[in-house]
Structure formats: C-alpha cells, structure tokens
C-alpha cells in the first residue's frame, strides 16, 4: 500500500516525508533506507538524522527541506533506473512501540530527452553538510547492499534544481505527514 | 570477538519477580538494537522484546508489555530484563541476541548467549 | 501478526542428501526473513538473514532463497553436523515471530 512517486532518469526525485515536532527544536529521529520499512530500523540505510542534525547519509541522498521543522522529505540526486523501489521513512518516536513508518515507491522512467546543461553548480559547494557517522569496532562487519559509491563532489545543472524545487511544493501536500505531541 | 551472557535466571513462584542481565564484549555495544527470546521446554522459539540504540524505544511481545520492562545501560555493555507477575507459562530458556545495526542491512539475530533458565512454580 | 509456517516439521533424510525446508509467511515480508540452526541443549545460530545472505562462518552447502511471502532454506549435501531443527523468522511486523520449527534427522 505504499504511495507511487515518479522521475526520469537523470533528474532529482524527491520523496516527501513530514512530522510536526512537539515544540521548535524538540526534534525526533528519522531514518531513510532503501526497502520497505522493516520492523525495526531503516532496511539499508541512507540517510539519518539524531536530536540535533543529519549526523549519516550517503551520496546522493540529501535533505532540501527544513529538517527542523519536521520536513524530511528526502532527494535523490541525478537518478538511474537503478534507484527504482520502495524507499521507507521512518519517524522514531520514543517510547514502547510508536514509530510511525511510510512506504514510498520510486518508479524511474528512461528520460525523453537529454537537454545540454547551460550551467553547472558544485553541490557539495551549495548545499554545505556537516558529517558525523559512528564509529564500528575492527571487527565489526555491516552489509549495507547495492548501496550507491560515494562520490563527495556532486553536480547538478541548475535547470534540475528549479525543476526540484517547483515539483517540491507540488508534492508537499501528498506527502507522509505526522504530529507528535 | 562477540559474546553475550546471560545471568539472573532460577525459581521462582508464581507472581513473583525476576531480573535478567546480559553482559556484552567483543563489539560496540550502543551501536545495535538488542533483543530476548525465550523457548519453552521442547517447545519453538519466541520472541520478547527489542530495544533501541539508547533505550529511548522499546517493542514487546503484546501479551507481555505490561509484565515485562526491556532496558540497557550502554555504560556498562548491559541488557537488562525485568519480569514481574511471573506466570508458569513463562517458564522457559531466555536468551539475549544482539539484532540489527545501525546502519541496517543485516536482519537476523546475528549473535545469541548460551541462554538462561527461568522456572516458574510452587 | 503475521505467521510464519514451516513444512515439514519434521524430516528423515540421509548423509549427502539435498534438503529443502520452506516457509510461508501470511503477510508479504518482503526478504525480511531469517533461517537459524539450533542443536539440543545450544543456542540458535544464524545462518541466512535478508533472504537469501549466508551469515559470517556458514558453509557454503547452505544457500536461502524466495521474496514476499515464500521463502526455502536448501542445503545441497547433508552433513552429520546438520542434523539439527531449523526455524524461520520475520524481521518485518511487529511481533517478530518465529516459524514452528522444523526437525531435521537422521533416517
């Protein structure tokens, strides 16, 4: 029963995910992983964030929205028919057994036409992100699956970042949407 | 290397209480979600409950929330299971596992302690 | 709940045989599903989780398959250190629940 989303490949595709914090800055925990959402957790993993700030993501994933006002919808940049699935946000609220967890489907069609880029602009230059992972043990071994390679410096056309941005508030009224408090 | 042990199990009467622990090495402890399972005397496996990195969310068993409390002390590596109201259905073997990481993927009581024997009867 | 079911539940077969346990969920779980081994009087062990991944240190005669809501643990030539039950579980609903089991001996 999960909701459809759609792209083409090479655009950004976003998914929209929102919670509506208990009080400013009271902010919850939210996982975004590849695969339905399991019981616990976020199947693979791609993007977390904690109390205070995205402290984990991956490359190409990225929030847009204003995390700390409960919107994380998450973006996937320059997609291929690879990122084609179901994706889960998940919203971890504390206490016994209140996670509220959305199933959002992805569906990537072949682009139509390939337009000739005007100007490019440096992500990782325009969207500054401070990065914190937790550190595993040596002996620590996690299979994270057919997770994307990292690639620090991610570039995108600005005509992808107007489209994103106008097909962001046309989908912000579909998307998942929770008050806690 | 990963270990996990179990202590705290023994006989105890109906409608008492009991207080499991499980000691873990060799990986980082807040760094995954932890469980109990328990199996009865020839009987299958069951699960109890699931806590979270910090302990801040806990998952259960419906038949058991209200007589069961899971916790953690990341402080020192510990998993706690507190049983209260005990019944002598809840006789049985239970052992702690660690389950899933942080950053997800591996789903499966990857590790188990060799289990701990609580018995419930007058 | 969702409810997992194992056949058979129990299986006489022989040192070299190919062995194949199925179990069905009652709700889609996508590969979610985890196979363990358990000897008298031991713990359980994992041996395949998401599916069809083989767990650290498992040999490779063991191999899981299936998605949604029908799943097989297969081992390809039976050892005597496999004569064991085996148990399917879910890790996708709350409550995880395990399979009944299934009883694996020697004929």
């Known amino acids: 029963s999960e909701v459809e989303y759609r792209a083409e490949v090479g655009q950004n595709a976003y998914l929209p995910c929102f919670y509506t914090p208990a009080a400013p800055g009271n902010l919850v925990p939210v996982c975004w992983g590849k695969g339905a959402c399991p019981v616990f957790e976020c199947g693979n993993v791609v993007l977390r964030t904690d109390e205070r700030d995205v402290n984990y993501w991956t490359s190409r994933y990225w929030l847009n929205g204003d995390f700390r006002k409960g919107d994380v919808s998450l973006t996937i940049e320059n997609v291929t028919l690879a990122d084609s699935g179901i994706y889960c946000c998940r919203i971890q609220i504390p206490g016994i057994m209140n996670d509220e967890k959305f199933n959002l489907k992805l569906v990537i069609k072949p682009a139509k036409v390939t337009p000739a880029p005007t100007r490019q602009r440096d992500f990782t230059a325009a969207f500054p992100r401070m990065l914190t992972t937790r550190g595993h043990g040596p002996a620590e071994t996690q299979t994270l699956g057919s997770l994307p390679d990292i690639n620090l410096t991610q570039i995108s056309t600005l005509a992808n970042e107007l489209r994103d941005s106008r097909l962001a508030n046309d989908l912000r009224d579909s998307g998942a949407t929770i008050r806690i408090g | 290397e990963v270990k996990l042990v179990e202590s705290g199990g023994g006989l105890v009467q109906p409608g008492g209480s009991l207080r499991l622990s499980c000691a873990a090495s060799?990986?980082?402890?807040?760094?995954?979600?932890m469980a109990w399972v328990r199996q009865a005397p020839g009987k299958g496996l069951e699960w109890v409950a699931n806590?979270?990195?910090?302990?801040?969310?806990?998952y259960y068993l419906d038949s058991l929330k209200s007589r069961f409390t899971i916790s953690r002390d990341n402080a020192k590596n510990s998993l706690y299971l507190q049983m209260n109201s005990l019944k002598a259905e809840d006789t049985a073997v239970y052992y702690c596992a660690r389950d899933v990481g942080y950053y997800g993927g591996n789903y499966g009581f990857a590790y188990w302690g060799q289990g701990t024997l609580v018995t419930v009867s007058s | 709940d969702i409810q997992m079911t194992q056949s058979p539940s129990s299986l006489s077969a022989s040192v070299g045989d190919r062995v194949t346990i199925t179990c069905r969920a009652s709700?889609?779980?996508?590969?979610?599903l985890a196979w363990y081994q358990q000897k008298p009087g031991k713990s359980p062990q994992l041996l395949v989780y998401n599916a069809k991944t083989l767990a650290e240190g498992v040999p490779s005669r063991f191999s899981g398959s299936g998605s949604g809501t029908d799943f097989t643990l297969t081992i390809s030539s039976l050892q005597p250190e496999d004569f064991a039950s085996y148990y399917c579980q879910q890790h996708y609903g709350s409550p995880l629940t395990f399979g009944q089991g299934t009883k694996l001996e020697i004929k």
């Open positions: 806590i979270n990195y910090d302990g801040s969310s806990t």
């Open positions: 709700d889609n779980i996508y590969s979610y």
């Open positions: 060799g990986f980082t402890f807040s760094d995954y979600y």
